[in-house]
């Protein structure tokens, strides 16, 4: 851009800054000529420690540039983010954070397994940490669900002691009435509709506990809830079809062996779920003693035919449709195995051989007046039924 | 012309988190420059908090940087302040200013009482 | 952290006089420092850049200079107006670091 003002003196040579250039090159520079300094991919602008995104000076009057030079250095992307549940490892060298530069990041071994793109990130130019997905974001330490110390299946009312570790993902619920849930993730529990109904306006009054054996015990990690979720196609008092609700909580659970949650159903979970599979109820429902139990206690129960707890609820005084499609039942012909009062909203979880994790099949729901009757059944809320429900309240939630 | 507006709370209680917006009218944060906020204390020392760049990359005084957190809206060509767990050594005056402080907006005050 | 010292707190001057303000950084920042106005209830006005470079719109009775740790704030014919109290800060590196204010004041 030449404008001859042979009046005016010319301006110093622009001396391109190291990693930059110089636009356009002249042979000499007068009054009103500019030149713009174009920086190596991988560096930037810089005036000190102030990003600028372009650069152009112009040549005055007095032979002098109006914008000092500014350097060109090279893109710092800065320390990462840290992880929840997880750790970053420096990959290019100790503390390395320029341009290229290559991260690692990883979760807490057994109890967290990463989500979205596998934790290696790259100093890029535009200086943001990039997966090579492309993602800006961090990468998610997911807690691993379904661990348990129980390897198998199969072999409460009628029910055994639970030892540590055996139902990781056994919550108390106390606030109103004495009730259970199961963790999801970190900080989500599911549970039955009807037991935290009265409290679905008032989250916070709920009490939760969970990483302990003993009701009682003094020794458990507390967490308080945000909000309720309460199926809208359930109807307090009238039936117990769509018996299921979600409790967000208000801050994330760290994962151990004695807190871990339990999976949701895959699609294939049918398979592990047909009449005679065996299922695992835990809670500190009431004993056959009529008691509520002072340590967990587990049930391991065959899947019911549909058709014949269908009918063995269709007597007085159960209305008709007591059993819906939305409902699983368990327990034995002859009785002696249940859950009961107390034990409501806690999970029925079956193994899936293939993963060897165990999963939620059913929520304690209802069942006869008189736990552990025979030709009469437990019955479940059949949360493969609801999977798309709870999938849509988590991502929104 | 450009201008930048600051606007908040005016009282917040110990430990509760502050939000600050910087609203800039006559030129778009993401154009260029850095866009900091400064806090001034009453006896007129003054401070720099950090910076949002034009690209979105931001930088933070260490002293705050585990409880700052500097975001933007591009389309209402705002940028915010966060700062977690406040205590009464946050009572201070907060601006917002573009690069090394060409244009500063008027500032808002902030009391941090219980 | 790069400190900025402004060792006078306090500069009386009159009107026509011409007052240097000086600043001294703790390391070495370059020409990255910057000056600024500020009058009571008022935000604060950038006046030079760069150590030497005027802001537009500045009197040109404004001057500044320096490198490296030592700067200085030159007002050659002081105006009423030019009472007020003036900041160095330094923008070479992170944290960016206010000097602690001198304040000019008429004798």
């Known amino acids: 851009h030449h404008h001859h003002h042979h009046a005016s003196q010319p301006c110093p040579y622009p001396m391109a800054p190291p990693n930059g250039h110089v636009s356009p090159v002249q042979a000499k520079y007068i009054l009103k000529d500019s030149f713009s300094i174009f920086c190596e991919t991988g560096y930037e602008l810089l005036q000190g420690h102030l990003p600028l995104k372009s650069f152009t000076a112009v040549c005055q009057k007095d032979g002098s540039w109006d914008r000092p030079m500014p350097a060109c250095s090279i893109v710092d992307c800065g320390p990462p983010d840290d992880l929840p549940s997880g750790r970053v490892e420096y990959i290019t060298g100790p503390g390395v954070t320029t341009y290229k530069a290559v991260i690692q990041y990883s979760c807490e071994e057994t109890f967290y397994t990463m989500k979205v793109n596998d934790g290696k990130y790259v100093c890029e130019a535009d200086g943001f940490w990039t997966s090579s997905k492309g993602e800006k974001s961090l990468p998610v330490c997911e807690p691993v669900c379904g661990l348990s110390a129980r390897t198998t299946g199969g072999r409460i009312y009628g029910g055994q002691k639970a030892k540590p570790g055996d139902f990781p993902w056994q919550v108390l619920i106390l606030g109103g009435t004495t009730a259970a849930g199961a963790l999801l993730y970190d900080n989500w529990v599911l549970t039955a509709a009807h037991a935290v109904y009265e409290q679905k306006h008032d989250a916070s009054a709920l009490d939760i506990r969970m990483g302990t054996l003993k009701r009682l015990s003094p020794h458990y990690t507390q967490a308080w809830s945000e909000a309720v979720f309460i199926h809208e196609g359930y109807t307090h008092d009238a039936g117990f079809d769509n018996d299921i609700a979600l409790i967000k909580l208000n801050n994330k659970v760290v994962i151990n062996s004695n807190i871990t949650p339990i999976c949701l159903p895959r699609k294939e979970a049918e398979s592990f779920m047909r009449t005679d599979d065996i299922g695992t109820a835990s809670g500190w429902g009431l004993t056959q003693r009529g008691f509520l139990a002072r340590n967990l206690m587990y049930v391991d129960i065959p899947i019911v035919d549909h058709q014949k707890c269908t009918a063995a609820y269709e007597k007085p005084p159960y209305p008709r449709g007591s059993v819906t499609a939305n409902m699983l039942c368990a327990g034995l012909e002859s009785g002696g195995k249940d859950s009961c009062r107390g034990d409501a909203g806690g999970a029925l979880v079956f193994l899936d051989s293939e993963t060897e994790r165990w999963f939620v099949g059913g929520i304690v729901s209802w069942g006869s007046m008189n736990c552990g009757e025979a030709g009469q059944y437990g019955v479940y809320t059949k949360v493969i039924n609801y999977i798309p429900w709870i999938e849509n309240i988590i991502s929104d939630f | 012309d450009v201008q930048l507006q600051e606007s908040g709370p005016g009282l917040v209680k110990p430990s509760q988190s502050l939000s600050l917006t910087c609203t800039v009218t006559?030129?778009?944060?993401?154009?260029?420059?850095?866009w900091n906020w400064i806090r001034q204390f009453s006896g007129d020392k003054l401070e720099w908090m950090g910076y949002?760049?034009?690209?979105?990359?931001?930088s933070y005084n260490p002293s705050l940087k585990s409880r700052i957190s500097i975001t933007r809206d591009t389309s209402k060509n705002q940028f915010f302040l966060h700062l977690s767990s406040v205590t009464t050594e946050d009572t201070a005056t907060y601006f917002c200013?573009?690069?090394?402080?060409?244009?500063w907006g008027h500032g808002t005050t902030l009391t941090v009482s219980s | 952290d790069s400190v900025m010292t402004q060792s006078q707190k306090f500069m009386s001057t009159s009107v026509g006089d011409r007052v240097s303000v000086t600043c001294k950084a703790s390391?070495?920042?370059?020409?990255?420092v910057a000056w600024f106005q500020q009058k009571p209830g008022q935000s604060p006005k950038g006046l030079i850049y760069?150590?030497?470079y005027r802001s537009s719109g500045v009197p040109d009775r404004f001057t500044g200079s320096g490198s490296g740790t030592d700067f200085t704030l030159t007002i050659s014919n002081v105006q009423s107006e030019d009472l007020a109290e003036y900041f160095c800060?330094?923008?070479?590196?992170?944290?960016?670091?206010f000097g602690g204010g001198t304040k000019l004041e008429v004798k």
């Open positions: 200013a573009r690069y090394w402080g060409d244009y």
């Open positions: 006559g030129y778009s944060i993401t154009s260029d420059y850095a």
């Open positions: 949002i760049s034009y690209s979105g990359s931001t």
């Open positions: 390391h070495n920042v370059g020409t990255n």
């Open positions: 760069s150590a030497s």
């Open positions: 800060l330094q923008y070479n590196s992170n944290p960016l670091t």
